[in-house]
Interface confidence: medium
């Protein structure tokens, strides 16, 4: 239904606290360099304005769209051009082009320092002094670094952050309580960020139809007892919600997400037997719980999929008369039977089925032609199963850090032109798949591995798109979203690459490495490893092991030395010489 004042409508639906959080996220995602204080001032102005519209929907400007109101606020910021350069050109445009322009200027890799968590005591002090401001800073810092973070989910993580601090700041050993809990929240949030970026990429590059297909497969896996009509309704709603969030319509997105949660809880009987526990929770937790819900039990009496989609003589008629509906039904039926497959794999199978019907329904004897289609799925299913098996075996043998290094070598060989920081970030994330997925039961491994890898590779594609340097990466990133992971897996050593010159300074280290936290130390070593591979793309595993082992010993030795600086200065050049020799 239409409302006189969109902003008043959203304020009333969402409540002041969530409204303010979402406006802060929106501004932080659009203008990623602005300090918190500047954004919070704008948030307060927008909130005050929304309140005047709640009091009187006919008040001046209350009938303007939210994009217009937000855009006008952003464009009124002094020195916008000084800080944001050509983004300021957006302000010359009218809506909806102005918002489109803002979206195009979102930076997936903003030049911001890594978010440093303050020391426990300091954190607790500032949290207890002003919890609202503390959590506001959290929203701002995460949103500006992740301009596509799913806004209502970010509010949920802020709530989690709040819970952890409330609990731990009363403990005697605050750090012991905070560190593991905040690490867990951070890990989940980072995964959520790459997953949502993938959804927005899907929406931006391939449109709503592609996203809806993804949603149909996912919902069918989770709710195998729901009928196709119900799954279609849920998928349509989820598509709309994600489109809104990816498009910067965060208030509408959060409001619609809450509505969907309400609908699901009111219709549990036709959706899933697993929803009740989620439905007793408050709104943010309820939506999050529903998004993470375990799969319902598969109905016991499902007939063979072949009956409807291979053996039936009307297959070509069904397909010709309503292609999307028929393919949607196929995707639904296949997905509800296979919670053990990744969504990417299910979409590849649906694509294969579609291609088979396109070919066969034009031939003289269609049933004979499409009769073997299910057997032809086998290699498509085996490929990711083998990927999971070999990678999980490697992870179990090497552990997370060793596995990350193996992945780093592999990807540096595939795309040595890509910048080292990007390769290290991608390999570290790809390497985490082991810890995340390989410990799961067999039936959950494939969906976990492949859908996680797809999201990480999407991040690599997004960063590469900004400064394209590798033809191979461009090729894999340009194709269909569901073919990306197999495309990257199939890449081999780039034979066209001219090895990088050996630069001693790249492998020169100083005593500051000794005081770095473990994670930063690992990154330094992995940076050196990537540079080694760029220098010698065809180095053997043994050669790399020798050099990296030598490097680790060197760092260990010098960090234990009485005169660390002197040790690094004298031993460093020896290490470089030995490394050159080992790789000759």
């Amino acid at each position: 239904e239409a409302h006189k004042s969109e902003i008043a409508h959203r304020f009333k639906d969402l409540g002041e606290q969530h409204f303010k959080g979402l406006v802060l996220i929106a501004f932080s995602q659009y203008l990623q360099k602005c300090p918190y204080e500047e954004h919070i001032k704008l948030v307060q102005e927008v909130t005050d304005f929304a309140k005047t519209c709640v009091a009187d929907e006919n008040a001046e400007n209350c009938d303007k769209s939210i994009h217009t109101l937000f855009g006008d606020k952003l464009c009124a910021i002094p020195k916008l051009r000084d800080n944001y350069g050509e983004l300021a050109d957006c302000c010359a445009k009218q809506e909806p082009e102005r918002n489109e322009c803002f979206l195009q200027h979102k930076d997936d890799n903003p030049n911001l320092p890594p978010f440093q968590r303050p020391e426990a005591e300091a954190m607790c002090t500032s949290f207890q002094e002003n919890p609202t401001s503390f959590l506001g800073h959290y929203l701002h810092e995460v949103a500006r670094r992740h301009p596509y973070f799913y806004a209502p989910e970010l509010l949920y993580y802020a709530e989690k952050y709040n819970e952890v601090l409330t609990q731990c700041c009363t403990e005697s050993d605050k750090a012991a309580c905070l560190t593991p809990k905040l690490d867990a929240v951070k890990e989940k949030a980072l995964v959520a960020a790459v997953r949502q970026r993938m959804k927005c990429s899907s929406m931006q590059r391939f449109g709503e139809r592609a996203f809806k297909a993804w949603a149909v497969a996912r919902m069918s896996q989770r709710f195998p007892n729901a009928e196709f009509a119900e799954i279609t309704k849920l998928a349509t709603d989820v598509t709309k919600i994600n489109k809104e969030c990816c498009h910067g319509d965060l208030l509408e997105c959060a409001d619609d997400r809450a509505e969907l949660a309400k609908y699901m809880c009111e219709n549990q009987a036709t959706i899933s037997s697993k929803l009740q526990a989620c439905c007793d929770k408050p709104v943010l937790q309820k939506s999050q719980c529903l998004a993470e819900i375990e799969h319902d039990n598969i109905p016991a009496d499902l007939p063979s999929i072949a009956a409807d989609f291979v053996e039936d003589k009307e297959v070509c008629k069904n397909y010709a008369e309503a292609k999307d509906v028929f393919l949607g039904t196929f995707l639904y039926e296949y997905s509800r039977r296979h919670p053990d497959y990744s969504v990417s794999l299910l979409l590849r199978l649906a694509k294969k089925y579609e291609a088979t019907l396109e070919k066969c329904c034009a031939e003289g004897d269609p049933p004979a032609c499409y009769g073997t289609v299910l057997a032809e799925f086998q290699p498509l299913v085996e490929e990711p199963k083998n990927l999971v098996k070999t990678n999980c075996e490697l992870y179990e043998k090497l552990g997370e850090y060793g596995f990350q290094n193996a992945v780093l070598v592999r990807y540096t060989q595939k795309a040595p032109q890509v910048s080292t920081p990007t390769l290290v970030e991608a390999a570290r994330n790809l390497g985490r798949v082991g810890t995340k997925c390989c410990t799961l039961p067999e039936a959950q491994r494939l969906p976990c591995v492949e859908d996680y890898l797809s999201a990480i590779l999407n991040r690599l594609c997004v960063l590469h798109e900004k400064t394209p340097v590798s033809e191979k990466v461009t090729k894999c990133c340009s194709g269909s979203l569901v073919e990306r992971r197999p495309c990257f897996s199939a890449l081999t050593v780039d034979e066209t690459y001219v090895p990088k010159e050996f630069k001693a300074e790249t492998f020169t280290f100083h005593s500051d490495i000794c005081t770095l936290p473990d994670k930063e130390k690992q990154i330094k070593k992995q940076t050196a490893l990537a540079e080694l591979v760029k220098h010698k793309p065809k180095a053997t595993e043994d050669q790399l092991k020798t050099v990296m082992g030598d490097f680790a010993q060197f760092v260990d030795k010098c960090c234990k030395a009485a005169d660390k600086d002197n040790c690094f200065a004298t031993e460093g050049p020896n290490l470089v010489a030995r490394s050159k020799e080992a790789l000759a």
């Epitope: 729901a226 009928e227 196709f228 009509a229 119900e230 007939p303 009956a307 409807d308 989609f309 053996e311 039936d312 003589k313 009307e314 297959v315 008629k317 069904n318 008369e321 309503a322 509906v325 028929f326 949607g328 039904t329």
Partner: nanobody, 126 residues
Amino acid sequence: EVQLLESGGGLVQPGGSLRLSCAASGRYIDETAVAWFRQAPGKGREFVAGIGGGVDITYYADSVKGRFTISRDNSKNTLYLQMNSLRPEDTAVYYCAARPGRPLITSKVADLYPYWGQGTLVTVSS
């Protein structure tokens, strides 16, 4: 759950017409793939005609094409089978069957339809 109740059967002469009705309750008929099957004495159930749920795509057995027409009235939640030019070999018990959640029939196999009416007898004889 879907309940189906057929009516409209009876005795008719060859060349005559009949209109069968199937009233559905428990679910909207336009969301459901529905079909008519028939069973002649001593034979198995045979697909006659079907219509998709949500999309009005119709399906007919070769033996009835051009003579029978399947339709539905969503406001009355009722399925119909208009039978013209009836022949003695059309004599059978006619059943209405439903596959909820199916946008298309996607099958003429009786076993794949979970919901059935009790049937109405059609006799074509002079």
